[in-house]
C-alpha cells in the first residue's frame, strides 16, 4: 500500500541547519540569508515499524537523491551514515530496519531514534560545522531535538 511522504528541512534546537559535507556525510552549522539554500531537503516517508504509543516510524531520504540515512555498526559502535539505494526500489513501505527512525514529536520538537539501535538518536554537536551522528545519550551535551520546516516547491 502506498504511504505518505513530505519534503522538509531540519534544524537542531540551537537552530543549526544540516548541509552536505562530502558525498556521504551531513554536518550542522548556522546558516543565514542566501546560504540557507545549502541546507539539505529531506524526503520523510511513513514506513512500517514496531508499534509504540508516541513513536511514528519514518525513513529520511535526501530529496531527489538516492541516499537515505541509515544506522549500522562500525567498529562495534552504532553509526549514522548516508547509504546509496536503487531508486527503482525506494522508498517503500517496508524499509529495512537500518533505514527506520522512530519519530518522537513533543511540543513541535522532534527526536529521531534509531529503530535498529533503541536509545540511539540522530544528534548534532554543540560545536559548529561538526558531523551529524548517532548518539547514545539524550539530555547531555549533544543535541537530539530538531524542528521541521516544510519546503515550498
Amino acid at each position: 500500500a502506498p504511504v505518505r511522504s513530505l519534503n522538509c528541512t531540519l534544524r537542531d534546537s540551537q537552530q543549526k541547519s544540516l548541509v552536505m559535507s562530502g558525498p556521504y556525510e551531513l554536518k550542522a552549522l548556522h546558516l543565514q540569508g542566501q546560504d540557507m539554500e545549502q541546507q539539505v531537503v529531506f524526503s520523510m516517508s511513513f514506513v512500517q515499524g514496531e508499534e509504540s504509543n508516541d513513536k511514528i516510524p519514518v525513513a529520511l531520504g535526501l530529496k531527489e537523491k538516492n541516499l537515505y540515512l541509515s544506522c549500522v555498526l562500525k567498529d562495534d559502535k552504532p553509526t549514522l551514515q548516508l547509504e546509496s539505494v536503487d531508486p527503482k526500489n525506494y522508498p517503500k513501505k517496508k524499509m529495512e530496519k537500518r533505514f527506520v527512525f522512530n519519530k518522537i514529536e513533543i511540543n513541535n520538537k522532534l527526536e529521531f531514534e534509531s529503530a535498529q539501535f533503541p536509545n540511539w538518536y540522530i544528534s548534532t554537536s554543540q560545536a559548529e560545522n561538526m558531523p551529524v551522528f548517532l548518539g547514545g545519550t539524550k539530555g547531555g551535551q549533544d543535541i537530539t531535538d530538531f524542528t521541521m520546516q516544510f519546503v515550498s516547491s
Epitope: 519534503n7 522538509c8 508516541d54 511514528i56 519514518v58 524542528t147 516544510f150 519546503v151 516547491s153
Partner: antibody
Framework: EVQLVESGGGLVQPGGSLRLSCTAS????????MAWVRQAPGKGLEWVGI???????YYASWAKGRFTISRDTSKNTVYLQMNSLRAEDTAVYYC?????????????WGQGTLVTVSS | EIVMTQSPSTLSASVGDRVTITCQAS??????LSWYQQKPGKAPKLLIY???TLASGVPSRFSGSGSGTEFTLTISSLQPDDFATYYC??????????FGQGTKLTVL
C-alpha cells in the same frame, strides 16, 4: 489561543466552484499537517484530504480531480478549492490539524463551515 | 481503500452502564486506530489514538483496545456528558484515511 477558523462556505449552484479558507492562530502552519474533513447533514464524517508541504497533498479517491488543497504559510492559511460541485457535496467542512506528522489522527478542529449546493 | 465498519449503529444505555462499541477494518491497520466523540453542532473531539492511548484531557473511564482488524472502545461507567456519537478512524501514514459510519449513544 490555539485555534482554527474556517470561512468561505455558503450557497453555490451545481457545477459551480467555491474556495474555503482555514486560518490558524497560536501556531505556525510551516510545520503543521492540515486536513479537511466533511460531514453531510445527519451523516457521518468523511475525510477529504491532507496537505504537508505544497507538493505533498493526499486525497480521498472521490475527491481527486475536483478538490484541491493548498496553503499560504505567510497568511497561516490552508485552502480547499472545490470545483464541479454537486448536491451530494453539501456538508459542513472542517479543517483539522494532524496530531503529529504521519499520526493520521486529528487533535485540533475548526468550528466548520457549511457548504450548500443547490439550484 | 480501507473500509471501517462500526457496530452497533445506535446504542441505548443508562448513566453508570458499561458500554462497548466495536470497529472492524477491512484490512490490517496494526494499531493505527483512533476514536472520536462528536456532539450535535460541534466538531469531533479526539478521544483515543494508537488504539489505546488516551488523548490529553480525556477521562480515564474511556479506554480502547485491539489491533489488526478488530478494535473496541469502552466507557466503563457512563456519565451524562457521554451521550454523543462516536467514530472510529484508521490512522497512521497510509494514503487512505476512513471513518466508521458512527455509533449514536442515546439515553435508555
Amino acid at each position: 489561543e490555539v485555534q482554527l477558523v474556517e470561512s468561505g462556505g455558503g450557497l453555490v449552484q451545481p457545477g459551480g466552484s467555491l474556495r474555503l479558507s482555514c486560518t490558524a492562530s497560536g501556531f505556525s502552519l510551516s510545520s503543521a499537517a492540515m486536513a479537511w474533513v466533511r460531514q453531510a447533514p445527519g451523516k457521518g464524517l468523511e475525510w477529504v484530504g491532507i496537505i504537508y508541504d505544497s507538493a505533498s497533498t493526499y486525497y480521498a479517491s472521490w475527491a481527486k480531480g475536483r478538490f484541491t488543497i493548498s496553503r499560504d504559510t505567510s497568511k497561516n492559511t490552508v485552502y480547499l478549492q472545490m470545483n464541479s460541485l454537486r448536491a451530494e457535496d453539501t456538508a459542513v467542512y472542517y479543517c483539522a490539524r494532524e496530531r503529529a506528522i504521519f499520526s493520521g489522527d486529528f487533535v485540533l478542529w475548526g468550528q466548520g463551515t457549511l457548504v450548500t449546493v443547490s439550484s | 481503500e480501507i473500509v471501517m465498519t462500526q457496530s452497533p449503529s445506535t446504542l441505548s444505555a443508562s448513566v453508570g452502564d458499561r458500554v462497548t462499541i466495536t470497529c472492524q477494518a477491512s484490512q490490517s491497520i496494526s494499531s493505527w486506530l483512533s476514536w472520536y466523540q462528536q456532539k450535535p453542532g460541534k466538531a469531533p473531539k479526539l478521544l483515543i489514538y494508537k488504539a489505546s492511548t488516551l488523548a490529553s484531557g480525556v477521562p480515564s473511564r474511556f479506554s480502547g483496545s485491539g489491533s489488526g482488524t478488530e478494535f473496541t472502545l469502552t466507557i466503563s461507567s457512563l456519565q451524562p456528558d457521554d451521550f454523543a456519537t462516536y467514530y472510529c478512524q484508521n490512522a497512521g501514514g497510509g494514503v487512505s484515511i476512513a471513518f466508521g459510519q458512527g455509533t449514536k449513544l442515546t439515553v435508555l
